[in-house]
Interface confidence: low
């Protein structure tokens, strides 16, 4: 902790500006005063604090807001930000997607900290849900986020937010959480039309059970095959030889490259070898 | 290296007709969807027509559909665009691409990594 002590005749602060950066830490915290530099927050980031110096600033806004920092100063810590802990951080209220935003925006282009992790968890609670507008800004700073969460977690988006969901935000997901994920999905396109409804299920298949998969293969979607090897195997496995055609249409071809790999070992060997030869790619069940 | 090399653009009046081609080597042809996409003066990029390896469930956008047929050649390693009863809006620069990407739909803009520097079409009287 830096020492108490008086300050110098002359270097009170009025304003927060770059003079500061010329005070002594000491200097920072006996002429800096805590109110002063909590209103004037956004004017921070535009000056090259020194690390050391970020360290008293924040103590002085500890000292000031012990029960946790009011969401006015919080939207304002750009850099500052980096110095909290988790502990810090979940003494806070945060309510407001730019306040979110401005935050993620400082620790862009890194991994999730616990910092990051701690401050996501206290929004997403204190909003009850994850919304559309809360899924979208974070998928956009880190498009593993949906798949870093719980099956339990996951059971708290609402199909509305499904909208906000890319392909690419699905690509760490694995079958237990695709498995929350899919029937909110087949909710929320419920009423497109079905090759626009296929574009939007797609990333969602691997938690898709028979009866849907069959479903499909009425519908000319041609599927690919790295969606289709995604697919859970007990949910393939009851497909016949004419559903698996449709359903991968042109890409049919591709079962051969893939006959060693599951789903479709499996499922070969669960076909009647007559049905096989039908496809004419030398499937051997 | 994957090359793509697109051909026969050129002035067209309205309602007149051009045949494109794109040549391509460096990949195994016969085993990849071919996509044939536009881009308008100022406007973005749109998928025009694709067409899986087995040249089966081909796709055009509501735009082209009825007017513009695709068509391959794997014995030559090409793909082909016949334009028929040309628009003042299909002046554009049209590209061809390949490598589709998992989890995208064939005519989808994000779907593939590779692609042609492209052939300029313009429909003017």
């Known amino acids: 902790e830096v020492e108490k002590t008086a300050c110098p005749s002359g270097k009170k602060a009025r304003e927060i500006d770059e003079s500061l950066i010329f005070y002594k830490k000491w200097e920072l915290e006996a002429c800096v005063d805590a109110a002063l530099l909590a209103t004037q927050m956004d004017r921070v980031n535009a000056i090259p604090f020194t690390y050391e110096q970020l360290d008293v600033l924040k103590h002085k806004l500890d000292e000031l807001y012990p029960q946790g920092y009011p969401e006015s100063v919080i939207q304002h810590l750009g850099y500052l930000f980096l110095k909290m802990s988790p502990e810090d951080i979940r003494k806070w209220n945060v309510t407001s997607l730019e306040t979110l935003k401005a935050l993620l925006e400082v620790n862009k282009g890194h991994e999730m900290s616990p910092q990051v992790a701690t401050l996501i968890d206290r929004f997403v609670k204190g909003r009850g849900q994850l919304d559309k507008d809360t899924l979208d800004t974070l998928t956009a700073f880190y498009p593993g986020y949906l798949c870093s969460l719980s099956p339990e977690e996951l059971s708290s988006v609402p199909p509305s937010s499904i909208w906000a969901v890319r392909p690419q935000d699905l690509d760490t997901c694995d079958p237990r959480q695709l498995d929350v994920l899919y029937p909110k999905a087949r909710l929320a396109f419920q009423n497109m039309n079905g090759s626009e409804y296929f574009v939007k299920i797609q990333s969602f298949l691997g938690g898709a059970p028979t009866e849907d998969l069959k479903a499909l293969s009425q519908q000319n979607v041609s599927m690919d095959l790295a969606t289709f090897m995604k697919l859970r195997t007990d949910a393939v496995l009851p497909l016949t030889v004419a559903e698996v055609q449709k359903l991968l249409g042109p890409h049919v071809e591709g079962l051969k490259a893939e006959e060693r790999h599951r789903p479709v070992r499996d499922w070969i060997l669960r076909q009647r070898q007559d049905d096989l030869d039908t496809l004419g790619l030398g499937l051997q069940g | 290296e994957v090359q793509l090399v697109e051909s026969g653009g050129g002035l067209v009046q309205p309602g007149g007709s051009l045949r494109l081609s794109c040549a391509a080597s460096?990949?195994?042809?016969?085993?990849?969807?071919m996509g044939w996409f536009r881009q308008a003066p100022g406007k973005g990029l749109e998928g025009v027509s694709a067409?899986?390896?087995?040249?089966?469930?081909?796709v055009y956008s509501d735009s082209v559909g009825g007017r513009f047929t695709i068509s391959r050649d794997n014995s030559k390693n090409t793909v082909y665009l016949q334009m028929n009863s040309l628009r003042a809006e299909d002046t554009a620069m049209y590209y061809c691409?390949?490598?589709?990407?998992?989890?995208?739909?064939?005519?989808?803009?994000?779907?593939?990594?590779?692609w042609g520097q492209g052939t300029l079409v313009t429909v003017s009287s």
């Open positions: 067409i899986p390896y087995t040249s089966t469930g081909i």
């Open positions: 691409a390949t490598d589709r990407r998992p989890g995208t739909t064939m005519l989808a803009v994000n779907g593939y990594n590779h």
């Open positions: 460096g990949f195994t042809f016969s085993r990849n969807t």
